[in-house]
């Protein structure tokens, strides 16, 4: 028989982690493995048909993606949809596929909303999702005794798909679910310095544990301004939500592992400011299969897609598409063995959910709602050389923090700052009120 996989991803624009130039080679490698393994879909042929999720400008589109999906559905009647990755593109497609009872598999669509499976029935996320970041942050807060207050700042940049809004939404909602904690959130425009000034005025009244989603440059600017304003001392900690680790990469940008460095005359101050900073990224898989997979992926991307893949955490996305597709094919194989058909979307999907799988990204666990348990890394600065290093990983499957370093985190005071100042945000603690009036008894 024939099994058709309908791909709805950006076909021209290569900048997305889920661009076809990146995911295509991963799909090729997965299908090559299916052919090579007699236990997977014996006697079946798997073919891919392509539709673009981008508009004429090469930008993810909530119009182009569902139109492409509808075309693919009527022309090819696919057994499964692969993608989209962009939130606004995936939303309408996911609603259509739910209505059609066709499984949708993606390693994108990380926003909180896709976890609502009555709306996005049969959507499986084999990649990371933002609510899972909230699980990590909640675990971190519990260990550090931060169970009262946090502040989340997110940047708005025209044309960036509101990545930071969705990231902070997932984090915010999950942290509030997991902990009985007050969380404030503030948006700022990256290109408007007056917004930064306003944030710095608000910060002291709203939090000491601060999460910031922004570009590396905006984060550095904020840290420099915070230092200037006296907010970078021992009382504050700033977490840069830099999930793909852009700020930690070399190349055209900052030197590897030194996110404060630009060579612009402000490096000394920036390094000092970054003493109060930690960086949160996805965890880079460290299993040997992943390194081997990346070699093949890069080779194939260059040979067949004329695309040069850079190193970095973005490669975990194509790798997750690869693993997700293999997991799907495994589920189809089992469904067929039990007398089902490739069009039995519900049955196939149920076989993928609440399941573990050993893939190129390592041990992969899809939870009972069809979302992958996600691993994260916490990076901290070595005060000796100013370089950032992974000090802690979060294992999403076991929900455990794992100490990667034998060195203590770099806390200026030697211990984590409290999440609420000693006297409260407005000096409201009566114990701190110096005007004690004696009473006559």
């Amino acid at each position: 028989g024939n099994l058709t996989v309908a791909v709805v991803l950006p076909l021209a624009n290569t900048s997305y982690p889920w661009s076809w130039a990146r995911v295509g080679p991963a799909v090729e490698l997965a299908l090559a493995q299916v052919k090579a393994r007699p236990d997977l879909l014996p006697g079946w042929t798997v073919r891919t048909v392509l539709g673009s999720s981008e508009n004429a400008l090469g930008v993810c589109s909530d119009t182009a993606a569902p139109l492409a999906a509808v075309d693919l559905k009527w022309e090819h009647n696919p057994a499964v949809f692969l993608g989209p990755g962009c939130v606004y593109a995936a939303a309408p497609v996911g609603r259509f596929t739910a209505h059609w009872r066709v499984p949708l598999l993606t390693a994108g669509a990380p926003a909180l909303g896709f976890g609502v499976k009555d709306e996005y029935a049969l959507t499986t996320r084999a990649g990371p999702s933002y609510a899972k970041l909230g699980d990590f942050v909640a675990a971190l807060h519990r260990r550090l005794g931060w169970e009262r207050q946090a502040l989340m700042l997110y940047a708005y940049r025209p044309g960036d798909e509101e990545h930071c809004f969705f990231l902070v939404e997932g984090l915010f909602m999950r942290v509030r679910d997991r902990l009985n904690i007050t969380v404030d959130h503030l948006e700022f425009a990256e290109d408007d310095l007056s917004h930064y000034t306003r944030l710095l005025r608000t910060m002291p009244r709203k939090g000491r544990v601060i999460y910031i989603c922004s570009s590396p440059d905006a984060f550095r600017t904020l840290m420099l301004l915070a230092l200037e304003a006296g907010l970078c001392g021992e009382d504050y900690v700033f977490f840069h939500l830099d999930i793909f680790g852009q700020s930690l990469q070399g190349g055209q940008g900052p030197a590897p592992r030194r996110p404060w460095e630009r060579g612009d005359g402000q490096d000394v101050s920036a390094r000092q400011a970054f003493q109060a900073a930690k960086i949160i990224t996805y965890k880079d898989p460290d299993n040997p299969e992943y390194l081997e997979f990346l070699k093949q992926l890069k080779h194939l991307a260059y040979e067949q897609f004329n695309f040069t893949m850079e190193d970095g955490l973005v490669n975990t996305i194509p790798a997750s598409f690869h693993d997700g597709l293999l997991l799907y094919i495994q589920a189809v194989t089992e469904t067929l063995a039990h007398g089902g058909t490739v069009t039995d979307g519900e049955n196939i999907t149920q076989r993928m959910w609440n399941r573990s799988f050993q893939g190129v990204t390592g041990y992969l666990k899809i939870d009972s709602s069809g979302d992958r348990e996600t691993d994260f890394s916490l990076w901290d600065m070595d005060p000796e050389n100013g370089a950032f290093r992974v000090v802690l990983n979060y294992n999403g499957t076991s929900q455990e923090l794992v100490a990667v370093s034998g060195r203590k985190l770099n806390w200026p005071l030697g211990y984590p700052p409290p999440d609420i100042p000693k006297c409260g945000f407005d000096n409201e603690d009566p114990a701190c009120n110096q005007d004690h009036l004696s009473t006559l008894e």
């Epitope: 260990r143 005794g145 802690l392 794992v402 100490a403 990667v404 203590k408 806390w411 200026p412 984590p416």
Partner: antibody
Framework: EVQLVESGGGLVQPGGSLRLSCAAS????????MSWVRQAPGKGLEWVST????????YYADSVKGRFTISNDNSKNTLYLQMNSLRAEDTAVYYC?????????????WGQGTLVTVSS | AIQMTQSPSSLSASVGDRVTITCRAS??????LGWYQQKPGKAPELLIY???RLPSGVPLRFSGSGSGTDFTLTISSLQPEDVATYYC?????????FGPGTKVDIK
């Protein structure tokens, strides 16, 4: 309740080997770095070795480097110290202790110790 | 390696006395210093971390201060159960190093 229980100590000849174990309970083992600290009879404390929870990073005192190997097994919540080419000056009570990299608590909990005697 | 020195090496004081032990590092270690109490025949116990922080359960008569190279452990009112040897530890950098210890007993 946090508990660390060392075992594996005993009498060994110079040049011989010994493997110490430390069974941990009452905390998430992999979330902490773990260390060995020793104390020669009538002397002060000496840090010996530390391993990260993931097992990826290890650190040794110069006096034991190349002879001792620290390791952990997170599935068993157990810390080990493989001691080779033992010398008389390695005679000591060996303690395991957990090291909290997150909160700055350094060696918060200690085991009761196990005595290693190196003598012919 | 960072050297740690402690003074005095031993002291005798009366119950209720204020006792001060100092620890000096051969180079700056910020506040990455802990104090440990070891009673005869027992394992050491953490008394102070990050130079001045008390773990829960440690009596408030113990306090720590200092930063950089010079540190102090103070027992505000010595009690009979405080008879022990006190060690400082730098965990700023590997190899970690302990001070030689200060033996405290009751006059």
């Amino acid at each position: 309740e946090v508990q660390l229980v060392e075992s594996g100590g005993g009498l060994v000849q110079p040049g011989g080997s010994l493997r110490l174990s430390c069974a941990a309970s009452g905390f998430t083992f992999s979330s902490y770095a773990m260390s060995w600290v020793r104390q020669a009879p009538g002397k002060g404390l000496e840090w010996v070795s530390t391993i990260s929870g993931s097992g990826t990073n290890t650190y040794y005192a110069d006096s034991v480097k190349g002879r001792f190997t620290i390791s952990n097994d997170n599935s068993k919540n157990t810390l080990y110290l493989q001691m080779n080419s033992l010398r008389a000056e390695d005679t000591a009570v060996y303690y395991c202790a957990n090291y909290d990299i997150l909160t700055g608590h350094s060696f918060e909990y200690w085991g009761q110790g196990t005595l290693v005697t190196v003598s012919s | 390696a960072i050297q740690m020195t402690q003074s005095p090496s031993s002291l005798s004081a009366s119950v209720g006395d204020r006792v001060t032990i100092t620890c000096r590092a051969s180079q700056g270690i910020r506040n990455d210093l802990g104090w440990y109490q070891q009673k005869p025949g027992k394992a050491p116990e953490l008394l102070i971390y990050a130079a001045s922080r008390l773990p829960s359960g440690v009596p408030l008569r113990f306090s720590g201060s200092g930063s950089g190279t010079d540190f102090t452990l103070t027992i505000s009112s010595l009690q009979p159960e405080d008879v022990a040897t006190y060690y400082c530890l730098q965990d700023y950098n590997y190899p970690f190093t302990f001070g030689p210890g200060t033996k405290v007993d009751i006059k």
